[in-house]
């Protein structure tokens, strides 16, 4: 088991500021937007735009807000109860299975295939074989036709931040 982390171990911006709002824990837990004090007697509010908590918790400090990477746009800012929501810029996408970075959408389909789905922040363009209608799952094709795609308009946010 790891040693207990104390407030002194935390970065200065994570330490409880004396002016932060306090309330009492309920059944040993603090509500979203708060963390518990080291002595367990108080719930201390998170700092807007700096940290957050989304659920009832017994965290010694709130979780740090995510900063959107370059290549991402901020859909909604970090609040005390919700992390930042970031989304890939137009023309790029992030797959659930490889969420580390936004990848460029392909500009067209391989020869013999037609585009049936646009580039969205969470998926590449979708290509199917002209004849069979089966999907193409390969990487960027060596030869592309002149079938081009314009970046899709996002219908809903794609967030890794929960």
């Amino acid at each position: 088991e790891s040693a207990l982390i104390t407030q002194q171990d935390l970065a200065p911006q994570q330490r409880a500021a004396p002016q932060q709002k306090r309330s009492s824990p309920s059944e040993g837990l603090c509500p979203p937007g708060h963390h518990i004090s080291e002595d367990g007697r108080d719930c201390i509010s998170c700092k807007y735009g700096q940290d957050y908590s989304t659920h009832w918790n017994d965290l010694l400090f709130c979780l740090r807000c995510t900063r959107c990477d370059s290549g991402e746009v901020e859909l909604s800012p970090c609040t005390t109860t919700r992390n930042t929501v970031c989304q890939c810029e137009e023309g790029t996408f992030r797959e659930e299975d490889s969420p580390e970075m936004c990848r460029k959408c392909r500009t067209g389909c391989p020869r013999g295939m037609v585009k049936v789905g646009d580039c969205t922040p969470w998926s590449d363009i979708e290509c199917v074989h002209k004849e069979s209608g089966t999907k193409h799952s390969g990487e960027v094709p060596a030869v592309e036709e002149t079938v081009t795609s314009s970046p899709g308009t996002p219908a809903s946010p794609c967030s890794l931040s929960g």
Partner: nanobody, 126 residues
């Protein structure tokens, strides 16, 4: 390969207690947050609790607040869920899960988790 194996489920009366365990066969267990989810018949899988990698601090769903406690033993690569004051609505298959990537401090949504156990059934009935 990540393997998660839950145990400790069973039938219990309302007001009773159970302790679930989840054994992980992955070397990175001690550096990753880990969570419990549950799925009742005909319902979607829902978040129960998640605990930080070092075992200090956890998130809890409002429905289990004050009744369930999430803990872990990194030396044994094991996650625990202590359940007390059980109710009929706690009847479900309980799953432990590891996130699909390691940089989310305390993920609490199904889509953020990529590795799942096979589940253990908890039935609460008189």
């Amino acid at each position: 390969e990540v393997q998660l194996l839950e145990s400790g489920g069973g039938e219990v009366q309302p007001g009773g207690s159970l302790r679930l365990s989840c054994a992980a066969s992955v070397s990175t267990f001690g550096t990753s947050p880990v969570g419990w989810f549950r799925q009742a018949p005909g319902k979607e899988r829902e978040f129960v609790c998640a605990i930080r990698w070092e075992g200090v601090g956890a998130y809890y769903a409002e429905s289990v607040k004050g009744r369930f406690t999430c803990s872990r033993d990194n030396a044994k690569n094991t996650l625990y869920l202590q359940m007390s004051s059980l109710r009929a609505e706690d009847t479900a298959v309980y799953y432990c899960a590891l996130p699909r990537r390691g940089d989310s401090e305390l993920p609490s949504t199904v889509k953020e988790y990529g590795y799942w156990g096979q589940g253990t059934l908890v039935t609460v009935k008189p």
